[in-house]
């Protein structure tokens, strides 16, 4: 025998109190799949969260973090403080990158500079707290009169592009 509730579409619930009639989800609730016996309460984006997408009868609200914070976890479960480039967020707060490491983003930890010599290249531009070193041609390629030219910064660094 087919369950009468299976006919209830997303945005409704199967109301046992009303002879298993499909009733619309009450305000501030939703059902994202059919055949639900209850509607779920909409997520509220408060405090460090702000609403990215409003709740509808068929979809939960989506939150994002306010300025100065970034999301962690699926569906932005938690907001974590941004640091400045050149810093990393430790469990004790934002801390400058140690010498020999860099962070060009507002999140994550400081990464060791590239060691150009491992690939037989020379350092063209020194690293900073905010930028990796730039490797140039191998030392043998730099004849005495050749000039080292600092190239323009790349248009896109890892981590900055959308998926």
């Amino acid at each position: 025998l087919q369950d009468p509730c299976s006919n209830c579409p997303a945005g409704t619930f199967c109301d046992n109190n009303r002879n298993q009639i499909c009733s619309p989800c009450p305000p501030n609730s939703f059902s994202s799949a059919g055949g639900q016996r209850t509607c779920d309460i909409c997520r509220q984006c408060k405090g460090v969260f702000r609403t990215r997408k409003e709740c509808s009868s068929t979809h939960n609200a989506e939150c994002e973090c306010i300025e100065g914070f970034h999301c962690l976890g699926p569906q932005c479960t938690r907001c974590e403080k941004d640091c400045r480039p050149g810093q990393e967020l430790t469990k004790k707060g934002c801390k400058d990158c140690c010498f020999g490491t860099f962070n060009d983003q507002k999140r994550g930890i400081c990464r060791p500079w590239t060691n150009c010599s491992l690939d037989g290249k020379s350092v063209l531009v020194n690293g900073t707290k905010e930028r990796d070193v730039v490797c140039g041609p191998s030392p043998a390629d730099l004849s005495p009169g050749a000039s080292s030219v600092t190239p323009p910064a790349p248009a896109r660094e890892p981590g900055h592009s959308p998926q």
């Epitope: 140690c98 930890i109 590239t114 990796d132 070193v133 900055h160």
Partner: antibody, heavy 120, light 110 residues
Framework: QVQLVQSGAEVKKPGASVKVSCKAS????????MHWVRQAPGQGLEWMGW????????NYAQKFQGRVTMTRDTSISTAYMELSRLRSDDTAVYYC?????????????WGQGTLVTVSS | SYVLTQPPSVSVAPGETARITCGGD??????VHWYQKKPDQAPVLVVY???YRPSGIPERISGSNSGNTATLTLSRVEAGDEADYYC????????????FGGGTQLIILG
Amino acid sequence: QVQLVQSGAEVKKPGASVKVSCKASGYTFTGYYMHWVRQAPGQGLEWMGWINPNSGGTNYAQKFQGRVTMTRDTSISTAYMELSRLRSDDTAVYYCAREPGYYGSGLDYWGQGTLVTVSS
Amino acid sequence: SYVLTQPPSVSVAPGETARITCGGDDIGDKRVHWYQKKPDQAPVLVVYEDRYRPSGIPERISGSNSGNTATLTLSRVEAGDEADYYCQVWDSSSDHPGVFGGGTQLIILG
């Protein structure tokens, strides 16, 4: 969707070199660092190094320095790992794995692995 | 370089809770990631940054990290959870930034 597809199994003689490829799709290749990790038979996971596909900058685990070279070809969204002077204990499955967009988090997508067998 | 220590194996009956530990000096100050590795399959990230699950990972998998020990907890374990589990951290201060624990084989009894 994000996919990393690696080249097929290789059999090499001791002293030879092997070059494993990892073709990325479903995202901007130059936007995410690529790491290489290996697992020898009956052993655990071992991190080998990373490459920044945008600049070509690399960092290798000290154990592999002088024997490993990581490169990329941005025109075909492919990363490469070359290991030279192979020994029998380099027999392992080699994986490429993508960093999720910032350093300090877990490696979120992995290739299927490439078995490299070193045998005389 | 930094060392992560895991027990070689953990055995648990179906439906019970498995706890896999990962020890390291002041590991609580680092961000720990956990991977599940099944034979002939690529590793899968199951927990990142101590306690966050990537989408698609069930809620019964959780992580915690403080002091000198990080813990991966699998509640209501199923036969499909049988695998090797590896903890991992990044250690920028060493010449080997990517560090994995030795791995723990989760054995489902019965």
